[in-house]
Interface confidence: low
């Protein structure tokens, strides 16, 4: 007699959403054989008995993960081959946070790995990654998992956080972090990476101080080319933080982001503005000190900022929010910087 | 809620019968692989019997090979051990159970006293 | 048939001890290997599969681990109402066979 299982091996891991067959097959030189499996969850509809051959097929379902068992028996000899099925989900959904790190102040990192199984902290790791190595002097914290929220029932997902206690980068600093996800199965080990791009100035390591109105780059493989106004600021396209929700933000020279605009027509005032056709909004996301201080104004594909009350804009980060899609862009404002009335 | 509820049970005179059932509710019966298991007074557990979802895979251990029966009515989601020759060792307490992955019993009933003594 | 050998036979304990039980298959049985706790006149209760794989709304004190031949239940920290008889039980082939029972006692 021969016993055959093909695959052959004690554990596979199976991609949700994707097909596996795992075929059982018995010869028996005193007729047929008897083969079947056993201990399984699935419905019996996942297996086709023909004589002397069992053919399981895993439809990478959740509910497929299990151990089953094929049985062959010929005569008074039987055989058992265990495989340990799991379906797994590691979609290259990375999201951190914040987009950007400055440089010469202690932060904190959070990186979030959405819709994973299994949710399991032995089989998910992160790092926090300078170059190639782990980032010495990180104080990873307490991790954090919550069932995401599911269009469809019986496909419970998780998404799982990492985050980190990140102390003053040193100068001059890195180009980037990246945060790596690392998921750990049978005989498989998959992993993503995302960029967290580092604030770096054009003339000097330090930050600006308040009579400098140099502007603040993002060095990202990711950044989308700056656009000036006059007022020597500099806006900073990044990254979208997760995939494009609609196909109407996308273009051939990559995604439609907002412009960040000086209006000069009611004092102190920046515009946000979408230009990527219709059903398209903007919303002030970001700036510095707390949001809730400044006068918004937000009516569509328009949204504009002003200190209350009137006078200098605030030294520091400005982002505006473009939905759907999810894409923004960062502005810098240099200290003591007053609108100039030949801005345009 | 997942149950099973053992009936059938009682003394007996060696070489009588008794049939045992076993009422499961909660899931879907016919797609589980159901046991019988027991275990005598003071004892360990001892695998009876088993038989798969359709009925028609079925195993016994030798003890009780030629003189038990197990069975399944998936219409009316009950599992039955009929047991003929009884012998003074048979006396345990019989629990079904169901069997799931890896052979392993994650839901048992409360047991069943069969007693054989003259 | 194959044998599962379990020691101890009975071990007492204190709240709060780490407790490890050990199981030996006489032939291997690669990860098949279950465990289940059992309270006087109660039915066995199910805590790991698989050799290592903790069962759904079981405390995570209780761990399984090892392959082949070789396999322990450990208790991290016993709590009051883990004393009970432990047994293993073998499922990579017919017939099923369990163990002996190990007896958790209080010290």
């Known amino acids: 007699q021969s016993f055959q299982v093909n695959p052959p091996e004690s554990e596979v891991a199976v991609a949700m959403g994707t097909s596996l067959q795992i075929t059982c097959s018995m010869s028996c030189d005193e007729g047929v054989a008897r083969v079947h499996w056993r201990g399984l969850d699935t419905s019996l509809g996942s297996v086709q008995t023909l004589p002397g051959s069992s053919i399981l097929s895993v439809r990478g379902m959740l509910s497929d993960t299990g151990t089953p068992v094929c049985v062959g028996s010929c005569g008074s000899r039987s055989f058992q081959h265990s495989v340990k099925i799991l379906v797994y989900a590691f979609p290259d959904q990375l999201v951190v946070s914040p987009e950007f790190l400055v440089p010469g102040q202690d932060q904190v990192v959070s990186c979030t790995a959405h819709n994973i199984w299994p949710a399991d902290p032995n089989s998910l790791s992160f790092a926090l990654l300078l170059g190639e190595q782990r980032l010495e002097g990180a104080q990873a914290l307490e991790p954090e998992q919550e069932e995401e929220i599911q269009e469809a029932e019986g496909t419970p997902l998780f998404r799982m956080t990492q985050r980190w206690r990140l102390p003053s980068l040193g100068t001059p600093a890195p180009p980037a972090l990246h945060c790596q996800v690392t998921m750990q199965l049978p005989k498989l080990v998959l992993t993503h990476r995302k960029e967290i791009p580092v604030l770096q100035s054009q003339t000097s390591p330090k930050p600006p101080n308040t009579t400098s109105a140099e502007p603040y780059i993002l060095t990202s493989s990711s950044t989308a080319e700056a656009v000036s106004t006059g007022l020597n600021i500099t806006t900073l396209p990044s990254a979208p933080p997760y995939p494009k929700l609609s196909p109407r933000t996308l273009s051939s020279e990559g995604p439609c982001r907002p412009k960040i605009h000086q209006d000069l027509e009611a004092g102190w005032e920046l515009l946000c503005e979408a230009s990527c056709g219709p059903g398209v909004t903007v919303r002030w996301t970001l700036a510095p000190g707390d949001l809730a201080t400044y006068h918004k104004r937000e009516a569509g594909a328009q949204a504009w900022l002003s200190v209350l009350p009137p006078g200098p804009m605030v030294e520091g980060w400005f982002q505006c929010r473009q939905d759907p899609g999810g894409e923004v862009t960062n502005l810098y404002v240099p200290g003591q910087v007053t609108p100039n009335s030949s801005s345009t | 809620e997942v149950q099973l509820l053992e009936s059938g049970g009682g003394l007996v005179q060696p070489g009588g019968s008794l049939r045992l059932s076993c009422a499961a509710s909660?899931?879907?019966?016919?797609?589980?692989?159901m046991h019988w298991v027991r275990q005598a007074p003071g004892k360990g557990l001892e695998w009876v019997s088993s038989?798969?979802?359709?009925?028609?895979?079925?195993d016994y251990a030798d003890s009780v090979k030629g003189r038990f029966t197990i069975s399944r009515d998936n219409s009316k989601n009950t599992l039955y051990l009929q047991m003929n020759s009884l012998r003074a060792e048979d006396t345990a307490v019989y629990y079904c159970a169901r069997e799931v992955q890896l052979s392993h019993y994650d839901y048992w009933g409360q047991g069943t006293l069969v007693t054989v003594s003259s | 048939d194959i044998q599962m050998t379990q020691s101890p036979s009975s071990l007492s304990a204190s709240v709060g001890d780490r407790v490890t039980i050990t199981c030996r298959a006489s032939q291997g049985i690669s990860n098949s290997l279950a465990w289940y706790q059992q309270k006087p006149g109660k039915a066995p209760k199910l805590l790991i599969y698989?050799?290592?794989s903790l069962q759904s709304g079981v405390p995570s004190r209780f761990s399984g681990s090892g392959s082949g031949t070789d396999f322990t239940l450990t208790i991290s920290s016993l709590q009051p109402e883990d004393f009970a008889t432990y047994y293993c039980?073998?499922?990579?082939?017919?017939?099923?066979?369990f163990g002996q029972g190990t007896k958790v006692e209080i010290k």
């Open positions: 039980q073998q499922a990579n082939s017919f017939p099923f066979t």
């Open positions: 698989g050799a290592s």
């Open positions: 038989i798969s979802p359709g009925g028609s895979n079925i």
């Open positions: 909660g899931f879907t019966f016919s797609s589980y692989w």
